[in-house]
Amino acid sequence: GIAIPRNSGCPNSEDKNFPRTVMVNLNIHNRNTSTNPKRSSDYYNRSTSPWNLHRNEDPERYPSVIWEAKCRHLGCVKADGNVDYHMNSVPIQQEILVLRREPRHCPNSFRLEKILVSVGCTCVTPIVHHVA
Amino acid sequence: GIAIPRNSGCPNSEDKNFPRTVMVNLNIHNRNTSTNPKRSSDYYNRSTSPWNLHRNEDPERYPSVIWEAKCRHLGCVKADGNVDYHMNSVPIQQEILVLRREPRHCPNSFRLEKILVSVGCTCVTPIVHHVA
């Protein structure tokens, strides 16, 4: 394991009043090599709803780096390379679990958190609202 | 907190050989607003690369239910509703963290695991391999 200095301001796991706290082993199963989605496929470039990947970095969170997709266009790319604004590029979102250091900077103490990330984009037919 | 009897077969958090282990407060914090945007879009139906959601259930994992996207077609749906096989519907994958009890039934001990899930589908231009 890694030797971690005890920070006096950090919670003590033996403290009976500490909220429902458990030990979590971070030796992750299934450590897939690539964490950068650009390496695993080039769909972000070849899609009719292409997206850019933005690095969201937070040292107080595990994983500290998360890639967020931002659709490049409002519309979708046609075969000729032009954008069709009768269609919409939209982000596909996924709720994921992360660990956040709490209190901040305490190396050994985290809180489970759910966050919403945009994974990629898809091309959809718009919803047309007809005014009466 | 909840009083939990120590199970003799469960790891001891003070054990120096216990793999990189941290304390985690499991009162899940949800960074999203009260309504859950991950659940509220019907893109899976409106996309040019529509998908079905299949239940992946594992009672020994949190979350116990994860939804896997399976693209409905090999090709992409055109404006007239027909499938264009010159384009490809492909799954967008995301690596997510889940919690697993380890050893099983030890109330205070978990292991973090990475799994790869298909979140939705996008329509891409195929890679054409020209034979010399």
Partner: antibody, heavy 117, light 106 residues
């Protein structure tokens, strides 16, 4: 096969509290939540709140916030729902249900709570 | 809260009939809609989850469809054991149920 077995019927006075139990037999709670849903006589179903026994995390419907407490004891695979400051409108059948956070797939048999002076 | 409105509130039908119950959500809920069957004095039973997926052990005469705000439960050929009350329920947000539809013998 998961079975949820609830405690027996209760008769309570207005202003008092009731605590209903729900025991998971044929397996542990696993990682699912346990939700509590009530049904007043001749009425529809109303979700009250839930707990994830693995974590102790609770989520309550706004209507019951401050009046309901949901707990779980993993060592006995039992969840509890305590409702305080009872009034006659709380007369209902109270159900526990296994909650995948998407649907309720296993239900207890129900516990009738009658609030009467 | 998301409001769920079922129609009709009751329906009289005969064995062998095709019965359709509709459920409307006050806002879009994607496909996060479930259908339950409840018989008098019994707990509800999950029939359909995620709008159209049949729960294991449920007869195939039950089917669900819809997305967004409008959903339908169909019983293709009503059987004697199907006379019951049916509830829709959303899980896009904190769960809420429709008011129920009672399927009665004609």
């Amino acid at each position: 096969q998961v079975q949820l077995v609830q405690s027996g019927a209760e008769v309570k006075k207005p202003g008092s509290s009731v605590k209903v139990s729900c025991k998971a037999s044929g397996g542990t709670f696993s990682s699912y939540a346990i939700s509590w849903v009530r049904q007043a006589p001749g009425q529809g179903l109303e979700w009250m709140g839930s707990i994830i026994p693995w974590f102790g995390t609770t989520n309550y419907a706004q209507k019951f916030q401050g009046r309901v407490t949901i707990t779980a004891d993993e060592s006995t695979s039992t969840a509890y729902m305590e409702l305080s400051s009872l009034r006659s409108e709380d007369t209902a059948v109270y159900y526990c249900a296994r909650d995948s956070e998407y649907y309720f797939d296993h239900w207890g048999q129900g516990t009738l709570v009658t609030v009467s002076s | 809260d998301i409001q769920m409105t079922q129609s009709p509130s009751s329906v009289s039908a005969s064995v062998g009939d095709r019965v359709t119950i509709t459920c409307r959500a006050s806002q879009g809920i994607s496909n996060w809609l479930n259908w339950y069957q409840q018989k008098p004095g019994k707990a509800p039973k999950l029939l359909i989850y995620a709008a159209s997926s049949l729960q294991s052990g449920v007869p195939s005469r039950f089917s669900g469809s819809g997305s967004g705000t409008d959903f339908t439960l169909t019983i293709s050929s009503l059987q004697p054991e199907d006379f019951a009350t049916y509830y829709c329920q959303q899980y896009s947000d904190d769960p809420t149920f429709g008011q129920g539809t009672k399927v009665e013998i004609k």
